[in-house]
């Protein structure tokens, strides 16, 4: 009898009630492998969705986000509305991250400026709610005496704009 | 025939993960949808996620942050992870394959959260 | 989440009886709708898909109607096995949600 089953294509199911006929999956439902015993439900996209790749009798439906939103989850099963960069998406809405924190996308959240003392270096560009800062040589390089290039940029603390 | 077996421990208290797992017959679950749902005491249902035949998994958002759905493709069996229950986590749990034209259901397992 | 609205909670009627179930949607379902019946100590099992798709080997006398957000199982006549819970359920969009059942009585 397992081998009866076996024998249905994809696109079909294998009907138990049928004495294990090789059935079409019925509208709206697909099988992607051979021996099914059901068909699986084919998904819809419709609200925030819309549909990448229709449903077919041996494929599901695809879907994606529409504008102003992106996926989240396996096989995009949600949508998250976009926010602009140097927001966060919270329960309220977009917000604009707080000051020391930043995000360069428009989705997830705002993350903390890098320390850049904790490398033992100095601030090199002023961190944005849109940008990390970008972080130089460490002040030991920056000392009289120390060979460099081209003269040092002076060191400011994140978030503070030059006079 | 296909069939779905639930097992797992019928009693776990407070703030413990609740661990179910649901063994599959006549069925591979390398192909279709393999879902988790429960009915709690007053006979409302809840669908809880799913794990498809790609491994990928879906949640209901009412559970993320405490659900999780695995599978063995070795075992043809697939599991539930319920972190921190709580007694309103008391329920009878079923896993199920919905499908077109045939939904298959396992028995259930009441499962009571209580210290 | 999309909220099924079953009703009655729970029905006496009579056998030989014409008894209706309705399921409102919150949102248009596009008929991917399920019925199920449970008997106690079962597990429920599928009575109808895309609304008004009676499944092999369920007596005739179910069947399934409706559209959009507003949807009904009837039992053309009643017979004594069919006493349990109708659960109503839409897989139109996840997560997938169920209404509240309609507990079924014999008069």
């Known amino acids: 009898l397992q081998d009866l089953c076996s024998n249905c294509p994809a696109g079909t199911f294998c009907d138990n009630n049928r004495s294990q006929i090789c059935s079409p999956c019925p509208p709206n439902s697909f099988s992607s492998a051979g021996g099914q015993r059901t068909c699986d439900i084919c998904r819809q996209c419709k609200g925030v969705f819309k549909t990448r790749k229709e449903c077919s009798s041996t494929s599901n439906a695809e879907c994606d986000c529409i504008s102003g939103y992106h996926c989240l989850g396996a096989e995009c099963s949600m949508c998250e509305q976009d926010c602009k960069q140097g927001q966060e998406l919270t329960k309220k809405g977009c917000k604009d991250c707080c000051f020391g924190t930043f995000n360069d996308q428009k989705r997830g959240i705002c993350r903390p400026w890098t320390n850049c003392s904790l490398d033992g270096k100095s601030v090199l560009v002023n961190g944005t709610k849109e940008r990390d800062v970008v972080c130089g040589p460490s002040p030991a390089d920056l000392s009289p005496g120390a060979s460099s290039a081209t003269p040092p940029a002076p060191a400011r603390e994140p978030g503070h704009s030059p006079q | 025939e296909v069939q779905l077996q639930e097992s797992g421990p019928s009693l776990v208290k407070p703030s413990q993960t609740l661990s179910l797992t649901c063994s599959v017959t006549?069925?591979?679950?390398?192909?279709?949808?393999w879902n988790w749902n429960r009915k709690f005491p007053g006979n409302k249902f809840e669908y809880m996620g799913y794990?498809?035949?790609?491994?990928?998994?879906y949640y209901n958002p009412s559970l993320k942050s405490r659900i999780s759905i695995t599978r063995d493709t070795s075992k043809n069996q697939y599991y539930l992870q319920l972190n921190s229950v709580t007694t309103e986590d008391t329920a009878t749990y079923y896993c199920?394959?919905?499908?077109?034209?045939?939904?298959?259901w396992g028995q259930g397992t009441l499962v009571t959260v209580s210290a | 989440d999309i909220k099924m609205t079953q009703s009655p909670s729970s029905m006496y009627a009579s056998l030989g009886e014409r008894v209706t179930i309705t399921c409102k949607a919150s949102?248009?379902?596009?008929?991917?709708l399920y019925w199920f019946q449970q008997k106690p100590g079962k597990s429920p099992e599928t009575l109808i898909y895309?609304?008004?798709r009676l499944v092999d080997g369920v007596p005739s006398r179910f069947s399934g109607s409706g559209s959009g957000q507003d949807y009904s199982l009837t039992i053309s006549s009643l017979e004594y096995e069919d006493m349990g819970i109708y659960y109503c359920l839409q897989y139109d969009e996840f997560p997938y949600t169920f209404g509240g059942g309609t507990k079924l009585e014999i008069k």
């Open positions: 949102q248009d379902i596009d008929s991917y």
């Open positions: 895309h609304a008004n």
């Open positions: 199920t394959r919905w499908g077109i034209p045939f939904a298959f």
């Open positions: 794990i498809s035949y790609s491994d990928s998994a």
């Open positions: 006549g069925d591979s679950i390398t192909s279709g949808y």
